[in-house]
Amino acid sequence: NKILVKQSPMLVAYDNAVNLSCKYSYNLFSREFRASLHKGLDSAVEVCVVYGNYSQQLQVYSKTGFNCDGKLGNESVTFYLQNLYVNQTDIYFCKIEVMYPPPYLDNEKSNGTIIHVKGKHLCPSPLFPGPSKP
C-alpha cells in the first residue's frame, strides 16, 4: 500500500524563494514521519528534510546546504525554500515515509514540480532609472 502525493506541476520562484506544498493521501497527525524534497529527475539531491515525531515541533534540516523550513498540515507538508539560484531550476519531488505506527509506508513517485527560479531584477526599471554605470 503506497501513499499518493500531489504537487503543483510548476512553480515560479520569484526573489529566489518558493513554497512547495506536498499533499498526501494520508493523515500525518500523531505519526512519526520523514518528509523530504528531492531535486532532479533521478531525485539525486535531497534538498530538505522535515521530521515529525508526535511532538508539536518539526525538525528541519538539509544535508545539501539548502535553506529551508517546513509547515505541517493534516495531510500535507509545505517546504519553504530561500536563496535559490537560477541554475537550481529543476524538477523537485516530494517524498514521504511513515515510520510509526506500523506498517512502514512510503509514497508512489509523484509527477514532481518544476521550480523555475527567476533571478532578482538587477537592471533598473525604465520608469525609475538607477544611477548610470560607467
Epitope: 525538525q59 539548502f66 535553506n67 523550513d69 509547515k71 536563496n83
Partner: antibody, heavy 120, light 107 residues
Framework: EVQLVESGGGLVQPGGSLRLSCAAS????????MHWVRQPPGKGLMWVSR????????SHADSVRDRFSISRDNAKNTLYLQLNGLRAEDTAVYYC?????????????WGQGALVTVSS | EIVLTQSPATLSLSPGERATLSCRAS??????LAWYQQKPGQAPRLLIF???KRATGIPARFSGSGSGTDFTLTISSLEPEDFAVYSC?????????FGQGTKVEIK
C-alpha cells in the same frame, strides 16, 4: 529598546544537563525567529539551534542535533535551550539572538551570553 | 557547509587609519553576508548585512562590499571604540557559518 537576557549557565559534569533561558523584551517576540549561537573560549562563533516564530519548527547544528532541544514560550517572551549529554567541547558562552522571520539567519540583536562550563 | 576564511587574523593600526578586513567564502554566497563587531565580554553587534547595507545606528565610517566569494569590511578612519574583533557570517546556505574573526588592535 530590544533586550535579550540569558540565564541558566554554570558548571556541569560531562554527561550532565542544563537548561538555558533567554528573556526577551522591547519587541514583539512572536514575530521573530530565535537562535542560539555559542562561542568556545578564545574561538569563533558557531550557530547551534533555531526555532521559528510560532515554535512549530526547529533546526540544530549536526554536532548537537541528538542532544540539544530548543523551545519558546511566546506568552512569556522566553526562549529556551535544553542541553543534554554535555561534553567538554560544549564549553562555551551561549548567546541568544533574534532574526527576522523573512531573513531567517541574520542576527540583528544578541544577548550578553551565558557561560556553560563542562568539566569533571 | 560553507567555510568563511577571514584575513588577516590580526590587524595592528592606529586611530585615524583605514582598516580593510577580508572574508572569503568556500563557494558563492551571493550577497548574503553579514559583519559583526565584538568587544571583550560583550555581545556581538550587527554592523553590515547583505554585504553592503549598514545596520541601524551604525556610523558611516563602516562600509561593506563584495559578492559571490570575496567580501570586504572597511573602516575608513578608526576611532578608539572600533578596536575589537570582527566576524563575518553567511546565511546563503544551511547551516549558517561564521568566519574565525579578525582582531583589530591598537598599534
Amino acid at each position: 529598546e530590544v533586550q535579550l537576557v540569558e540565564s541558566g549557565g554554570g558548571l556541569v559534569q560531562p554527561g550532565g544537563s542544563l537548561r538555558l533561558s533567554c528573556a526577551a523584551s522591547g519587541f514583539t517576540f512572536s514575530d521573530y525567529w530565535m537562535h542560539w549561537v555559542r562561542q568556545p573560549p578564545g574561538k569563533g562563533l558557531m550557530w547551534v539551534s533555531r526555532i521559528n516564530s510560532d515554535g512549530s519548527t526547529a533546526s540544530h547544528a549536526d554536532s548537537v542535533r541528538d542532544r540539544f532541544s530548543i523551545s519558546r514560550d511566546n506568552a512569556k517572551n522566553t526562549l529556551y535551550l535544553q542541553l543534554n549529554g554535555l561534553r567538554a567541547e560544549d564549553t562555551a558562552v551561549y548567546y541568544c539572538a533574534r532574526a527576522d522571520s523573512t531573513t531567517w539567519y541574520e542576527f540583528d540583536f544578541w544577548g550578553q551570553g551565558a557561560l556553560v562550563t563542562v568539566s569533571s | 557547509e560553507i567555510v568563511l576564511t577571514q584575513s588577516p587574523a590580526t590587524l595592528s593600526l592606529s586611530p585615524g587609519e583605514r582598516a580593510t578586513l577580508s572574508c572569503r567564502a568556500s563557494q558563492s554566497i551571493s550577497i548574503y553576508l553579514a559583519w559583526y563587531q565584538q568587544k571583550p565580554g560583550q555581545a556581538p553587534r550587527l554592523l553590515i548585512f547583505d554585504a553592503s547595507k549598514r545596520a541601524t545606528g551604525i556610523p558611516a565610517r563602516f562600509s561593506g562590499s563584495g559578492s559571490g566569494t570575496d567580501f570586504t569590511l572597511t573602516i575608513s578612519s578608526l576611532e578608539p571604540e572600533d578596536f575589537a574583533v570582527y566576524s563575518c557570517q553567511q546565511r546563503h546556505n544551511w547551516p549558517p557559518t561564521f568566519g574565525q574573526g579578525t582582531k583589530v588592535e591598537i598599534k
